[in-house]
Interface confidence: low
């Protein structure tokens, strides 16, 4: 039987004979920045070209003896996981290795930078097909390393990195914290986050997804036919690099944003046991385990969206937090969340010619998060319509009045410290789906978009008695673009999207003595693109 | 993921151009910043990545590196330019004393300087 990790990333719908075509990833070149490798290992022989790039620090310690097999151990194993003949993910991918880690697995930020520059120069000298760069390494947060990754990503290169093995917030490490990089955490055969001694996989909002990373069988540098089991977020990142190579080989024109959205879309959802993560990180950490798409084609018609959390605003009175989408993505909605419930809502605003999502802390609040819903919507023209506080008992309303524009998200923002519990008596007159409704003391912001064939509808789930969590999901074929709460009263902690489900969280009702007057409604806006569906049918 | 102005230790050295007549003051209203790894054991003091502003050409990077070496030499400091970056980021890698940081931050075109640090196989 195939190793557990390859089994795990293979969707059940694959027929046995269709399991990872032998030439999977053949149009893609994967660069590996790691230790030296044993390129004549039977798993990777003829598949990995060792470049002449080497930039490593001296080994520590006077008694350190350089043993070739130990020097090659980490890189050889990872090359095998990406493209190995027997135990590799993308068996057809060709690889190029750069040595940036010494025999003790240690390197420098500067050496890694020079390696990334080497790749960019190689790309300019001899442009090839899609490039994937695997960075199975981590250091402390580095502005310069993140900046270099951003530049390379904007040059069309897909970068995949290890989240780090420090059982810590991945945002504190680089290149894991670089927004343009696909950051991968590690899970085991039981879908538990991987424990590594006293530490384990990193977590948090800077992780894009998880992948198998414990007891991964791959090429061992001890001999040319040896295999060994290794564990870590490097192994997890290698799986995702392999999956990316497979996807890019099937669809070479995919952009980084499209690839990331597909990786998220085809992942196994909600299978990780979140109890392993610190409580404050659970909501921020994606519950996604990477998998290959069920077939190499046919995803083009989907409207893909993902949720992007901001950094925490911090507790100061006027603190704000900003969540941004990638350059090729559209911000279709914006929400906010505060564990204390003390927040002043959120708004979509233009920054550098692009919409961002900004959340506002309130006096006495411990801080807020902004949550952006970032979607792939070709030829979209989106704008924000705002209505100031109405002060009327009916509450504040705003709608999309431009011809052909549909509502994709609602946000509300208020200046008062506490909205109180005044609830608009009418939440939304039926037959007016393009309308956002909110508290009378709040400004309401509607995200209105025009895109070919885009259609959206509003789904609500209201619970008469106060609940700590209310959810509403979009049905099959529809994608969640907007998630908000009605009413925006002070006991609502916030709203956020998890996959295709809108989650509204409220304060623990047992401690707040809430009444049924404070019942909460979760409001989801679900969209689909008939244009994308038609385009994909025409292709087939 | 992390914003570029995110959670790392930052040391902003205010520029007082009168302290060093040899250094050109940077463009009005901008302050070059110094960054180092928040995890002390991973720091590699003595090697620095000097990152220049985005549109800086290779020739300007080389000129800025030479200027740093010249000004350091006048103060009796040895420096070594280990690498000049171009293609991804404009800038250079320099081996020098931390005592030269304030001088380096005042050089023209400098956006920020980061002390080198370790990375590890995961």
């Amino acid at each position: 039987s195939i190793p557990w990790n390859l089994e795990r990333i293979t969707p059940p719908r694959y027929r046995a004979d269709e399991y990872q075509p032998p030439d999977g990833g053949s149009l893609v070149e994967v660069y590996l920045l790691d230790t030296s490798i044993q390129s004549d290992h039977r798993e990777i022989e003829g598949r990995v070209m060792v470049t002449d790039f080497e930039n490593v620090p001296e080994e520590d310690g006077t008694r350190f003896h350089r043993q070739a097999s130990k020097c090659d151990s980490h890189g050889t194993h990872l090359a095998g996981v990406v493209s190995g003949r027997d135990a590799g993910v993308a068996k057809g991918a060709s690889m190029r290795s750069l040595r940036v880690l010494n025999c003790q697995g240690k390197g420098t930020v500067s050496g890694t930078l020079i390696g990334l520059e080497f790749i960019r120069k190689s790309q300019l000298v001899q442009p090839v097909g899609p490039l994937v760069v695997l960075l199975p390494l981590a250091g402390g947060y580095s502005r310069v390393l993140n900046a270099a990754c951003q530049r390379l990503a904007r040059a069309g290169v897909v970068l995949v990195t290890a989240a780090g093995n420090f059982r810590d917030d991945a945002c504190l490490y680089s290149p894991a914290s670089a927004p343009e990089v696909i950051t991968v955490g590690a899970t085991n055969a039981q879908d538990q986050p991987v424990t590594l001694g006293t530490l384990g996989t990193n977590f948090g909002r800077c992780v894009d997804l998880f992948a198998p990373g414990e007891d991964i069988i791959g090429a061992s540098s001890d001999c040319s036919t040896c295999f060994v089991s290794q564990s870590g977020t490097s192994q997890a990142a290698a799986h995702v690099a392999g999956i990316a190579a497979m996807m890019l080989s099937a669809e070479p024109e995919l952009t980084l944003a499209e690839l990331r959205q597909r990786l998220i879309h085809f992942s196994a959802k909600d299978v990780i046991n979140e109890a392993w993560f610190p409580e404050d990180q659970r909501v921020l950490t994606p519950n996604l385990v990477a998998a290959l798409p069920p077939s190499t084609h046919g995803a083009g018609w989907q409207l893909f969206c993902r949720t992007v959390w901001s950094a925490h605003s911090g507790p100061t009175r006027m603190a704000t937090a900003i969540a941004r989408c990638a350059p090729d993505e559209e911000l279709l909605s914006c929400s906010s969340f505060s564990r204390s419930g003390k927040r002043r809502g959120e708004r979509m605003e233009a920054q550098g010619g692009k919409l961002v999502c900004r959340a506002h802390n309130a006096f006495g609040g411990e801080g807020v998060y902004a949550i952006a819903r970032c979607c792939l919507l070709p030829q979209a023209n989106c704008s924000v319509h705002t209505a100031p506080p109405a002060e009327a008992s009916m509450g504040t309303r705003v709608h999309c009045h431009q011809q052909g524009h549909v509502l994709t998200g609602c946000s509300s923002h208020w200046e008062v410290e506490d909205l109180g519990t005044h609830k608009p008596p009418v939440l939304r007159p039926r037959g007016q789906p393009n309308q956002c409704v909110g508290h009378r003391e709040a400004s309401i912001h509607a995200s209105c978009c025009h895109a070919p064939g885009l259609e959206c509808k509003v789904k609500e789930h209201g619970i008469p008695a106060p609940q700590e969590q209310v959810t509403v999901a979009c049905e099959e074929g529809w994608t969640l673009t907007g998630c908000s709460a009605l009413p925006g009263t002070s006991h609502v902690l916030g709203a956020y999207a998890v996959d295709n489900t809108c989650v509204v969280r409220s304060r623990d009702v047992s401690t707040t003595g809430s009444t049924s007057e404070e019942a909460v409604t979760a409001v989801a806006i679900c969209c689909r693109s008939r244009h994308l569906a038609q385009a994909s049918q025409e292709l087939q | 993921q992390e914003d570029e102005d995110g959670d790392y230790e930052e040391l902003v050295l205010a520029l007082r151009s009168e302290e060093d007549g040899l250094a050109e003051a940077p463009e009005h209203g901008t302050t070059a910043t110094f960054h180092r790894c928040a995890k002390d054991p991973w720091r590699l003091p003595g090697t620095y990545v000097v990152v220049l502003k985005e549109e800086t050409h290779l020739s300007q990077s080389e000129r800025t590196a030479r200027r740093l070496q010249a000004q350091a030499a006048r103060r009796g400091y040895l420096t070594k330019i280990l690498h000049v970056f171009h293609g991804l980021l404009p800038g250079f890698l320099v081996k020098m004393s931390g005592g030269l940081l304030e001088l380096a931050l005042k050089l023209p075109h400098v956006d920020y300087i980061e002390e080198d640090s370790s990375v590890f196989a995961q």
Partner: antibody, heavy 118, light 113 residues
């Protein structure tokens, strides 16, 4: 030949300690998680503990947690079970079992008998 | 913990006849990510260690005769011996490996009638 051979069993008093060993051969030891499973006389099978191929992850049955320690030596291709604070109810044949890396056991040793009695 | 319950506790079947052993888990062992049931069947002959017969609830281990078959999904599983042979006299155990602690059924003793 692919096989597992347990040793180290015997008679021990309650509260005493014993160390079981399991020598593996015929397969790449480092690639597979390993387990200890026990069987009290005339009774069914009872999983005791597992250790991952790298040795980085261990799991124990509640009944032995804090008393037993599973470990492995890659260079010797040997699995160990250090049993402390033994009780009468620990009396059983202890089997060493190779894990398929999913949690089912595709190779078993012949077992070693541990008797805890005063 | 997942509790595994086998039925019957013992079974006597004539040579050449069909033998059926059932196993029920206290919670589903079907893993939705790969659509696999994390359930195995073992045979233990007197004085011998157990031997893996079936994994993934229905996949025969190599070398196991094709008269042995496994079926079921979720919480209810069955081991079937289509035509009982003398060498099949043993105790049969089901095991879930969905999560630790891994747990076995109490065993079913199969004899010849």
């Amino acid at each position: 030949e692919v096989q597992l051979v347990e040793s180290g069993g015997g008679l021990v008093q309650p509260g005493g300690s014993l160390r079981l060993s399991c020598a593996a051969s015929g397969f790449t030891f480092n690639n597979y998680a390993m387990n200890w499973v026990r069987q009290a006389p005339g009774k069914g099978l009872d999983w005791v503990s597992t250790i991952s191929g790298s040795g980085g992850t261990t799991n124990y049955a509640d009944s032995v947690k804090g008393r037993f320690i599973i470990s492995r030596d890659s260079s010797k291709h040997t699995l160990y079970l250090q049993m402390n604070s033994l009780r009468a109810e620990d009396t059983a044949v202890y089997y060493c079992a190779k894990d398929s890396n999913w949690g089912n056991f595709d190779l078993w040793g012949r077992g070693t008998l541990v008797t805890v009695s005063s | 913990d997942i509790v595994m319950t086998q039925s019957p506790d013992s079974l006597a079947v004539s040579l050449g006849e069909r033998a059926t052993i059932n196993c029920k888990s206290s919670q589903s062992v079907l893993y939705r990510s790969n659509n696999r049931n994390f359930l195995g069947w073992y045979q233990q002959k007197p004085g011998q260690p157990p031997n893996l017969l079936i994994y993934w609830a229905s996949t025969r281990e190599s070398g196991v005769p094709d008269r042995f078959s496994g079926s079921g999904s979720g919480t209810d599983f069955t081991l079937t011996i289509s035509s009982l042979q003398a060498e099949d006299v043993a105790v049969y155990y089901c095991q879930q490996y969905y999560t630790t602690p891994y747990t076995f059924g109490q065993g079913t003793k199969l004899e010849i009638k």
